[in-house]
């Protein structure tokens, strides 16, 4: 299993949506014993790790497991839409939440976490961050623009 | 094999500061977790009262913000808890935890201290 | 604040018999967490995220239920499994909150 950013910056004018993704390939434990648990969070440039800070974005704090005998259990504690944000995972491995009509401070450093349970046991965390940088309308695009990861940059951290 | 240990006064008195410490063998409070306090009362059951993390930001129960301090001796790889202006009500057994982020459960538990509050 | 309602209060059964805890929460929650406590000891994590069993626990505790609904079962009762049982949910935060607890015996 490995966690990959599409992209590593998204600079965004404020009211635009913006939506945010991590990749999961799942080569090995497609339809065996691994299940995984999953989040977005808000994080910061630490000095040795990055995305050891947790904190919720927009006060909400999302659950998803991928569960053998629940195939998609989206558990998060309330509907994400309230706090205008979308949560999404498809078939090709795509994790992404969306933002919507961002505002200056939802600037800062994104990440997701994606945790391998295997035999009950949390067996590796994966995760994959991003930026986002959101900018007064003044002068601005009109339009969110992703930047690619540079090549070193495009692999997931990894914590036993 | 990671050890918490509660300490402190078991008695305490009306209007005074509850002072409790949480040591911490086996692991660095610095490294990573957060560390927890939860007090149990047979009226309440278990209570969350705060937690400090490894990196010395704290968060805690609205219900007992205004009152309730914790913080840290890294150190001594300590952290404490302070409840000011106690009642009554605030006698129960008090347990550090120590909680990953994500998923965010107690895995490790002090043995717990008993504290009463009583003139 | 998410309260959690765990029922019955008590529960009485026999060794080898199934028990079935429940645990519902006053709004959708996350992930459910499950504790043992036995007398004069601290609680003990039994199930982690709803359904993961935590190390060393026997494969006869297991977890399931998603949203409102939670529940913990012990498919083969032991006499040691003589405990009071609580949930936690840390999805709406703060505060962490825990269940009122479920008294089980088993005799």
């Known amino acids: 299993i490995k966690v990959t950013t599409p992209y590593s910056l998204y600079v965004c004018p404020e009211g635009q949506n913006v939506t945010l993704t991590c990749r999961i390939l799942d080569s090995v434990s497609k339809g065996h014993d691994a299940n995984f648990l999953k989040t977005w969070f808000l994080s910061s440039r630490g000095e040795v790790q990055v995305c050891k800070e947790h904190r919720p974005i927009r006060n909400f704090i999302s659950h998803h497991q991928h569960h053998r005998s629940h195939p998609a259990v989206n558990a998060s504690h309330d509907q994400p839409q309230k706090h205008g944000l979308e949560i999404a995972y498809d078939n090709h491995g795509n994790f992404s939440i969306t933002l919507h009509n961002v505002t200056l401070s939802d600037s800062g450093l994104y990440c997701c976490l994606v945790i391998e349970v295997k035999h009950h046991h949390p067996e590796r965390r994966l995760y994959g961050y991003m930026e986002l940088q959101v900018q007064t309308g003044k002068g601005s695009a009109s339009t969110c623009t992703a930047y690619p990861p540079n090549e070193q940059d495009s692999d997931s951290i990894t914590a036993a | 094999q990671v050890q918490l240990q509660e300490s402190g006064p078991g008695l305490v008195k009306p209007s005074d500061t509850l002072s409790l410490t949480c040591t911490v063998s086996?692991?660095?409070?610095?490294?990573?977790?957060?560390w927890n306090w939860i007090r149990q009362t047979p009226g309440k059951g278990l209570e969350w009262i705060g937690h400090?993390?490894?990196?010395?930001?704290?968060s805690y129960n609205p219900s007992l913000r205004s009152r309730v301090t914790i913080s840290r001796d890294t150190s001594k790889n300590q952290f404490s808890l302070k409840l000011s202006s106690v009642t009554a009500a605030d006698t129960a057994t008090y347990s550090c935890?120590?909680?990953?982020?994500?998923?965010?459960?107690?895995?490790?538990w002090g043995t717990g201290t008993t504290v009463t509050v009583s003139s | 604040e998410i309260v959690l309602t765990q029922s019955p209060a008590t529960l009485s059964l026999s060794p080898g018999e199934r028990a079935t805890l429940s645990c519902r929460a006053s709004?959708?929650?996350?992930?459910i967490h499950w504790y043992q406590q036995k007398p004069g000891q601290a609680p003990r994590p039994l199930i982690y995220?709803?359904?993961y069993r935590t190390t060393g626990i026997p494969a006869r505790f297991s977890g399931s239920g998603s949203g409102t609904d939670n529940t913990l079962t012990i498919s083969s009762l032991e006499p040691e499994d003589s405990a009071v049982y609580y949930c936690?949910?840390?999805?709406?935060?703060?505060?962490?909150?825990f269940g009122g607890g479920t008294k089980l015996e088993v005799k």
């Open positions: 935890a120590r909680a990953l982020y994500y998923p965010w459960y107690f895995d490790v």
């Open positions: 086996g692991y660095s409070i610095t490294s990573d977790y957060t």
């Open positions: 400090i993390t490894y990196s010395g930001s704290v």
């Open positions: 709004s959708s929650v996350g992930y």
């Open positions: 995220a709803t359904y």
């Open positions: 936690q949910q840390w999805s709406s935060y703060p505060p962490i909150t």
